[in-house]
Structure formats: C-alpha cells, structure tokens
Interface confidence: medium
C-alpha cells in the first residue's frame, strides 16, 4: 500500500536532527577591525563620508575571534533557533585551493570554516561537512582544473584527493561526518554533450570519492574516528500506469540509472550495475545510441568497492515514469524514460510532488539492494512561496518524517539522521529555506523544533528524554579541542 496511517513513536536517542546548507562562501577577513587595529577613527558622515584617523590615540586590541565574522554570527543565530543537533554545509573547493593544488592554500578560508564548526560545537551542533558541492549553474572547481577539462580529466580525481586530505588534516579533529561529493549522479545535467561525456565524468567522480575515502581510512581514521560517504540524489520512481509492465520496468530502470549507477560500484561490486550496462549495450547494438559505460579495470573495481561508511541520500520527491524509446547518445535518452506530471498531486511552485510514501519505498529498496547499513537522509525539503507561514513545508516535513519513522519502526531500516533542506534561501532562487534571504524566520521552524524535541511523534505519555550517554556523542572530545587548538 502507498499511504498507511500515521504511526506514533520516536526516533532513537542518537538520531541526527540536521539542517543542510549548500556552499558556504568564506569571508575573507573578520569584519571587526576595531579589535585588531589600535587606532581610533572619526567618520566624516556629512562630508566625504570617509574615516579619519585620530592621531595620538591608541586603543586596546584583542586577538581575532570566530564571532568577528559577521556571517558566522548569522549562521549561529539561525542554527540556534533551529534546535538541530547537526549542521551540514559545504566547503568551497575553489576558495580553499584557488590553484587546484596545494601550492597555494587559502589559510583564511580554512580558518573561517574551522570557526563555523567550532562555534557550532559550542552550541551542541556537530558538523557534517561536504567537500565538493557542484551546482547546475557552477561546477565549483578551481579555475585551473576547470580549464583542464574538469571531470573529464582523470587527474582531477587526484587533485580532489589532495584537497580532501588537506581538509581532513585541518578540520578532522572536529568533524566526524564527511560527505566527499554532493550528488555526483546529477552532474549529468552539466556533462550532457554526450552519454560518453556523462559516463566518463561520473567515472572520474567515483574514483575521486574512492581515493579520498581510502586516504581517510589509511591516514586519518585511526586518530579521528570519523565516517565518510558521498550523497546521492535519490528520488523514488513509480510507474505512471501501475497496470503497464513497461512502466514498472521503466521505474526500476530509473533507479538503476540514477542511484545504482553510483551505489553499485561503491556499496557492492566495484562495477556499474549489470542492468545499466546491458541496457546501454543493447541500445548500442540496435544503433540507437553510441554511448558505452567505461570498462573498469580490476584495479579500479578494487579501488571503488566498499568505500562508504554509511549511505547518504538526498530525497525530495517521487517521479512518475513511463517507457519511451528515445534515440540519441545522451544519458537522458539512454534511459528511455519519460516523466509524467501528475496534476492531481499536491505540488510545490517548482512542481515537486509531495509524495511522502516514496521515501519509505526508497529506504526499503536501498536496504534490499545494498544490505543493512546506516542510512542518513542528507537533504530533504520542498520549496514554498510563503515568506512567513510556510504551511506546505510544515506538511511536507511532518508527512515525510512520518514515513521515515515507519521505515525505522516497522521496516527496521537503520536510519541514523534526517537533514532538512535548507537553512536559508538565496535571492531569486526557489524558496527552500527555513529562513528568508534576509534571515527572517518562517513558521516551519517551530514545527521542526517540536518534532526534534519530541524525537518524532510520541504517544501522549511517553518520555522524550534521553540520558546524556544515549544522546549523539560522536564528538565529545571536540569541545575540548575547540578550546585548546588555536584557530
């Protein structure tokens, strides 16, 4: 059955209640110069509007502090109001390593990110840090790598490993959850000139992730004891017509091309899904596509296999799909899938359908295919036009969390965390934020607060209290380090 009655119950005490943000652009300088500059200034407000130094007067200075970054203050204020236990944000690779290699490290950017993490920890909020978060508009690569063919060039994978190593070294004492790459399975939207470009770029992204994971496993895990994965875009697929076999096959094919494409090599076999390989090969034989999945060497298969510590899924909606034979040598046409917009469904302004039961089906599918592993939903949310009373978002959160709870309580899926997307919206973008672009809070925050403090949807008389030992204590030593390690 699709919709089942709501359940009453709670998530475990160590469940991660999170909120996700995309790339945090580092502030280049702390914006409180009065603490580092000993001079006094007078502002000529009516004349030339410049600051004029007052000679002969010297002020006491103090060392720079993390809260001197205006941005960080804003982040912390929003996070404190969210009452989350975890904050997922992404570093800006191009800011940290502008040259793409370790020859020019932007220490100020790293200091900024360290501040975000350490100040969060003081509020009891642990970080899940994403190393690379490409967006459709911008690949987010350092310029030299972009000009050297980006992800079509295998050496970008090695550059990523070096960057990851730097981040593990600089932040790994405080960060215990890492995402290497956000939604590599969506870079097909950018590398879409041909299927071979798409599959070639995906191959190098897989290698980049595996190299970073193995570096962490070998050099950093023994002392830092963290966990590393990558986040896959993981919308569920349903047949548009449940009575048509071809639609059922199309739905499974969508999951193979969208999720298994990356999950199979990393979680299971070290190679691409047989179903995907065979489907592309059959189209190739019939002259409908010249695409081909890369043939992996034995060494590449061994490199990829098993390089995840948990499963991280970004889930937003369910797509209704049907089979339609498409000619052309691109990823989109290789799948032979057509999407159907069901206008009877509750949908957002950007046409995201609200289909809560899809997330439960997804979680069961992942467990059935890849085994009983820890799963985090690392981004989940909806756009809502309302600037204050965002009722669609409240409805979405409540219903989707209900289905996640069913997966936990009834299906026994090892769900470890839910990260709502996203903290603050950006100007002129779909409104996914809990806060507006000028930091005004929306009413969905109170709703999420309530779910977090109740640990779900408890029975009337059940306690939501957790003992200190049961709570998420993944970074007990972090607070000590925050005080002791210089920023």
């Amino acid at each position: 059955k699709e919709s089942t009655p709501d359940v009453q119950g709670q998530f475990p005490c160590d469940f991660s209640w999170g909120v996700t943000e995309s790339v945090l652009k580092p502030e280049s300088v702390a914006s409180s110069p009065q603490f580092s500059d000993p001079h006094l200034y007078v502002w000529n407000a009516t004349g030339n509007r410049l600051l004029h130094r007052v000679e002969g007067v010297r002020l006491k200075t103090r060392p720079a502090q993390c809260t001197d970054f205006v941005n960080i203050k804003k982040q912390l204020e929003m996070l404190a109001r969210m009452k989350v236990t975890h904050y997922r944000f992404a570093l800006d690779w191009a800011s940290v390593l502008p040259t793409g290699n370790l020859s020019a490290v932007n220490r100020q950017a790293l200091r900024y990110y360290r501040c975000v993490v350490s100040e969060g920890l003081k509020l009891g909020i642990s970080a899940m840090v994403t190393l690379y978060y490409p967006t459709h508009a911008h690949l987010g690569l350092p310029e030299p790598l972009l000009h050297a063919d980006g992800w079509l060039n295998p050496s970008t994978a090695e550059a990523f490993q070096a960057y990851a190593g730097l981040c593990f070294q600089e932040l790994g004492d405080l960060v215990k959850l890492w995402i290497t790459i956000n939604e590599p399975n969506r870079l097909s939207d950018i590398y879409n000139r041909s299927g071979n470009d798409t599959y070639g770029a995906a191959h190098n992204l897989l290698v980049a992730h595996a190299l970073a994971w193995r570096l962490y496993d070998r050099q950093f895990r023994p002392s830092q004891r963290g966990a590393v994965s990558l986040s896959l875009h993981a919308d569920w697929a349903e047949p548009a017509n449940p009575y048509a076999d071809s639609h059922w096959r199309a739905a499974e094919r969508f999951l193979q091309f969208e999720i298994a494409w990356f999950a199979e090599p990393l979680f299971k076999t070290g190679d691409y899904p047989a179903a995907m390989r065979e489907y592309i090969a059959s189209k190739h034989r019939r002259g409908l596509s010249s695409s081909a999945l890369p043939r992996l060497t034995e060494a590449e298969r061994r490199l990829l296999k098993g390089t995840v510590d948990f499963c991280a899924l970004n889930h937003f909606t369910t797509r209704f799909v049907m089979h339609e034979q498409l000619a052309g040598s691109r990823y989109d046409s290789d799948r032979d899938i057509q999407f159907l917009q069901d206008i009877t469904r509750l949908s957002s302004p950007t046409r995201l359908a609200v289909i809560p039961w899809g997330v439960r089906k997804l979680l069961r599918w992942v467990r059935r295919n890849y085994g009983d592993m820890d799963i985090y939903i690392t981004a989940s949310g909806i756009d809502d036009q309302a600037l204050e009373d965002d009722r669609l978002r409240k409805y979405y959160l409540g219903k989707y969390l209900q289905e996640v709870l069913k997966a936990y309580l009834i299906d026994k899926v090892r769900i470890k965390g839910y990260y709502a997307f996203k903290l603050a919206e950006e100007k002129s973008k779909p409104r996914f934020g809990f806060f507006t672009s000028d930091f005004k809070a929306k009413s969905s925050i109170q709703f999420y607060n309530k779910v977090i403090s109740s640990r779900g949807f408890p029975f009337e008389n059940s306690s939501s209290r957790c003992s200190q030992t049961q709570e998420n204590t993944e970074c007990t030593v972090c607070l000590f380090l925050v005080q002791k390690k210089p920023l």
Partner: antibody
Framework: QVQPQESGPELVKPGALVKISCKAS????????INWVKKRPGQGLEWIGW????????KYNEKFEGKATLTADKSSSTAYMQLSSLTSENSAVYFC?????????????WGQGTLVTVSA | DIVLTQSPDSLTVSLGQRATISCRAS??????????MHWYQQKPGQPPKLLIY???NLESGVPARFSGSGSGTDFTLNIHPVEEEDAATYYC?????????FGGGTKLEIK
C-alpha cells in the same frame, strides 16, 4: 604497526594439507584485500589470489584454483590460506600482503612469510 | 595472462653509478590515465618491499634515488646514485587485470 603477522614454518607430508594464517592489525581489516604470494628458492614471485574480508569474496590465479582456498575471520582480523594435496612443488615461502589504498593493487604491507616444506 | 619480461637478469653496478632495470609487458598495462605497473625490492630472507607504484609514484619512505617511468608495455626502474644497501633482487608487477603477474626478477650487485 600495519605489517601482517604470519604463522610459523610448517613441515608436512605429501598429500596432506596445511593452513597458514595472516593476522592483521593497525587498520580496518574488512576494508582491504589480503593477497597471497608464493616464492620458491631460485624462482620468482607468483600471485596466488586475494580475499576481500569485507564480504569474503575471492579471486584466484587459475594455476592455484583447487590447490589454494582463501578464507578470513573478521572477529580475529585473520586471513587464512589452506593448501591441499601437497607435493614437493608446493614447498615454498608464502607471503600474505595487504593491497595499497589507491586501488592500484600494489602490495604495500607484507607478512614476514611462512616456510612450507613438503617432505616424506 | 600478461607476461612480464625483465632485463637484465642480473647486473653489477659501481657505487654511486646508475642502475637501470627494464620490464616489458606482453600487452599494455595502461588504461584511463594510469599505468598499473609496480616495482619491488627483495633481500634474502625478507619479504618484498614496494618501491614504486603506478609506474612512477614513489612509495612513502623510499629514498628519492629510486624512480620509475614508462607507459603501455615498456617500463624502467632507475636507481641513482646506487648505494651498498641497494644490493637485492628487483621485481616488476602488473595489476592491469587478473591474474596479477611478476617479472622474473633482476639481481643487482654492487662493486
């Protein structure tokens, strides 16, 4: 210290079988292949096969199919190689070696070797 | 199976000079930007020690006087300047496909 520890020398009779062990430490045992390599006096090195302790999957050099059986015990972080129907050809030093972290399949960490002597 | 042929079988090099060892594969061991060829040093009574991985990458802790080069089917290990402790047998190994194979070995003596 990541270097694997292999079991001691074995003197066995022709036709018998022997099981040698390789205990791993200093890293997560389930995440890296353990390879086995044969070295006979005056001859080169021969790769026998690997086992991936994470799921117990194995791959063998065809030459050693039916001769060598690779297993792993996750609870004790120990890999084993059993050699059956032994002949004098099987007298050799057997090394276990952990693969590197690049997936290049080069062997970074080697055990000290176990000498197996097959003699009546 | 890919056959690796090392040459020479043995060589004697004066202290401080250059030693060059070749390894030829019966088919290419390079693909998608990588050359799956590695070099090891083995001394009597000891396990082999990895020197070079992926044709040209120096394993950590190995002196910089060791270097590797090549792609496709032809690979070279260079040692310069040779030191007394370099007396050993050197093996190449490929991991392009199964089964992995080793070269026959080159015995280096120092005079």
């Amino acid at each position: 210290q990541v270097q694997p520890q292999e079991s001691g020398p074995e003197l066995v009779k022709p036709g018998a079988l022997v099981k040698i062990s390789c205990k791993a430490s200093g890293y997560t045992f389930t995440r890296y292949d353990i390879n086995w390599v044969k070295k006979r006096p005056g001859q080169g090195l021969e790769w026998i096969g690997w086992i991936y302790p994470g799921d117990g999957s194995t791959k063998y050099n065809e030459k050693f199919e039916g001769k060598a059986t690779l297993t792993a015990d996750k609870s004790s972080s120990t890999a084993y190689m059993q050699l059956s129907s032994l002949t004098s050809e099987n007298s050799a030093v057997y090394f276990c070696a952990r693969s590197d972290y690049y997936g290049s399949r080069s062997f970074v960490y080697w055990g000290q070797g176990t000498l197996v002597t097959v003699s009546a | 199976d890919i056959v690796l042929t090392q040459s020479p079988d043995s060589l004697t090099v004066s202290l401080g000079q250059r030693a060059t060892i070749s390894c030829r594969a019966s088919k290419s061991v390079s693909t998608s930007g990588y050359s799956y060829m590695h070099w090891y040093q083995q001394k009597p009574g000891q396990p082999p020690k990895l020197l070079i991985y992926l044709a040209s990458n120096l394993e950590s802790g190995v002196p910089a006087r060791f270097s590797g080069s090549g792609s496709g089917t032809d690979f070279t290990l260079n040692i310069h300047p040779v030191e007394e402790e370099d007396a050993a047998t050197y093996y190449c190994q490929h991991s392009r496909e199964l089964p992995y194979t080793f070269g026959g070995g080159t015995k280096l003596e120092i005079k």
